[in-house]
């Protein structure tokens, strides 16, 4: 395990195993223990939570977090100003919208204040860590006797998102799913009027504006068919 310690000006100092170089393996002390990994997620580019598993520390420890942006105008080291807590100790940091710069390299440093040399630094590409809010306002339109169109809205730039639609009837054991590009609409060409359908959608910040792997939560489901289709056969937007 090699750990790269970064300084705000971009200089890199590579050390091994968190300063284990002079310590014999039979007397490893608490000061040499690796710090927990920091995981950051940017929620709809409104705020970002950077969290760590505080219980991986050998004893309750208020770890501190600093951050900066590498090789940019924002390379000044910033202290976390809004810590998240678990069992009364720090377990994360929340950054607000004005502190988020998606397309600059984000550098985050975790440190044990009781052992200042015990620190770990990570570099993150925030555009790959965006998680949008779940799609909203799902609506169904009957385009023809056997064709349905599903539409939805996202509280974000639509062209940045791809979507996954899942649907099933009350006769199905599993979902059928279909990928949808940034157009946020989906057509089902062949609908059986005797069956009740359920649709749901989730979205991802990929591939045009970032390469995020994490999907949003699923939308609230929307239903169509059998016992409800008689009420309004051409428009249905019930949220369960």
């Amino acid at each position: 395990l090699n750990t790269t310690i970064l300084t705000p000006n971009g200089n890199e100092d590579t050390t091994a195993d968190f300063f284990l170089t002079t310590m014999p393996t039979d007397s490893l002390s608490v000061s040499t223990l690796p710090l927990p990994e920091v995981q950051c997620f940017v929620f709809n580019v409104e705020y970002m939570n950077c969290t760590w598993n505080s219980s991986s520390e050998p004893q309750p420890t208020n770890l501190t977090l600093h951050y900066w942006y590498k090789n940019s105008d924002n390379d000044k080291v910033q202290k976390c100003s809004h810590y998240l807590f678990s069992e009364e100790i720090t377990s994360g940091c929340q950054l607000q919208k004005k502190e988020i710069h998606l397309y600059q390299t984000f550098v985050v440093q975790l440190q044990d204040p009781r052992e200042p040399r015990r620190q770990a630094t990570q570099m993150l590409k925030l555009q790959n860590l965006v998680i949008p809010w779940a799609p909203e306002n799902l609506t169904l339109h009957k385009l023809s006797e056997s064709q349905l169109e599903l539409n939805w809205n996202n509280r974000f730039l639509n062209h940045c998102l791809e979507h996954l639609v899942q649907y099933r009837t009350d006769w199905d054991h599993s979902w059928t799913e279909q990928s949808v590009d940034y157009r946020h609409k989906f057509s089902l060409p062949s609908v059986d009027g005797q069956k009740r359908y359920t649709f749901r959608v989730r979205s991802r910040f990929n591939p045009l504006c970032g390469s995020a792997q994490h999907w949003s939560e699923w939308s609230h489901p929307i239903h169509w068919g059998s016992n409800t289709s008689k009420e309004n056969p051409f428009l249905f937007a019930l949220e369960a």
Epitope: T25, S27, L28, S29, V30, T32, L33, P34, S55, P58, Q59, P60, E87, E88
Partner: antibody, heavy 119, light 108 residues
């Protein structure tokens, strides 16, 4: 089932060493710190130190530093506690205790190993 | 090092009675980091209470913990025959982990 099984009782002479084992089963051995606690006859509980099986890092109580070594063998999910230069006042039951994965208390204990130091 | 002092040393009570055990710390302990253990002769300690007041899995609700700062209490509302044992408090908020010297609850 989740358990810690310790090695059997030992009788040692002053100045000798003892190595107690603690076999973990039923959970992810490397995911929990393992602590060692001892109890002299008729006395209370005394914390000795911990080992983090994932990395092998250790931390010992001051009074045992230089005499105690905690190790582990992840391939057989077993932790060890070795105490050297034994004295008669080291006669005690030695327990391994698993630290909870979400906090710092001990949620699982071995049944203990009695070590008797006598000339 | 935080020193924990338990009182009384021995508590003589009858089944059905209420037991109140005290644990006092030499300096403030966050209530998140105080535990109580029960130990019967020839057995390992068993976790009863963590975080000063949360019952461990499988522990009957006649056991309850309370307190904060330097004063903590374990209460057994109605003693059952199997509750007669030694009880230890422990702080796990700072190294070294320390235990009280124990309170023995014996049958009167």
């Amino acid at each position: 089932q989740v358990q810690l099984v310790q090695s059997g009782a030992e009788v040692k002479k002053p100045g000798a060493s003892v190595k107690v084992s603690c076999k973990a089963s039923g959970y992810t051995f490397t995911g929990h710190y393992m602590h060692w606690v001892r109890q002299a006859p008729g006395q209370g509980l005394e914390w000795m130190g911990w080992i983090y099986p994932h990395s092998g890092h250790t931390n010992y109580a001051k009074r045992f530093q230089g005499r105690v070594t905690m190790t582990r063998d992840t391939s057989i999910t077993t932790a060890y506690m070795e105490l050297i230069r034994l004295r008669s006042d080291d006669t005690a039951v030695y327990y391994c205790a698993r630290r909870s994965g979400r906090s710092w208390y001990f949620d699982l204990w071995g049944r203990g190993t009695l070590v008797t130091v006598s000339s | 090092e935080i020193v924990l002092t338990q009182s009384p040393g021995t508590l003589s009570l009858s089944p059905g009675e209420r037991a109140t055990l005290s644990c006092r710390a030499s300096q403030s302990v966050s209530s998140s980091y105080l535990a109580w253990y029960q130990q019967k002769p020839g057995q390992a300690p068993r976790l009863l209470i963590y975080g000063a007041s949360s019952r461990a899995t499988g522990i009957p609700d006649r056991f309850s913990g309370s307190g904060s700062g330097t004063d903590f209490t374990l209460t057994i509302s109605r003693l059952e025959p199997e509750d007669f044992a030694v009880y230890y408090c422990q702080q796990y908020g700072s190294s070294p982990w320390t235990f009280g010297q124990g309170t023995k609850v014996e049958i009167k």
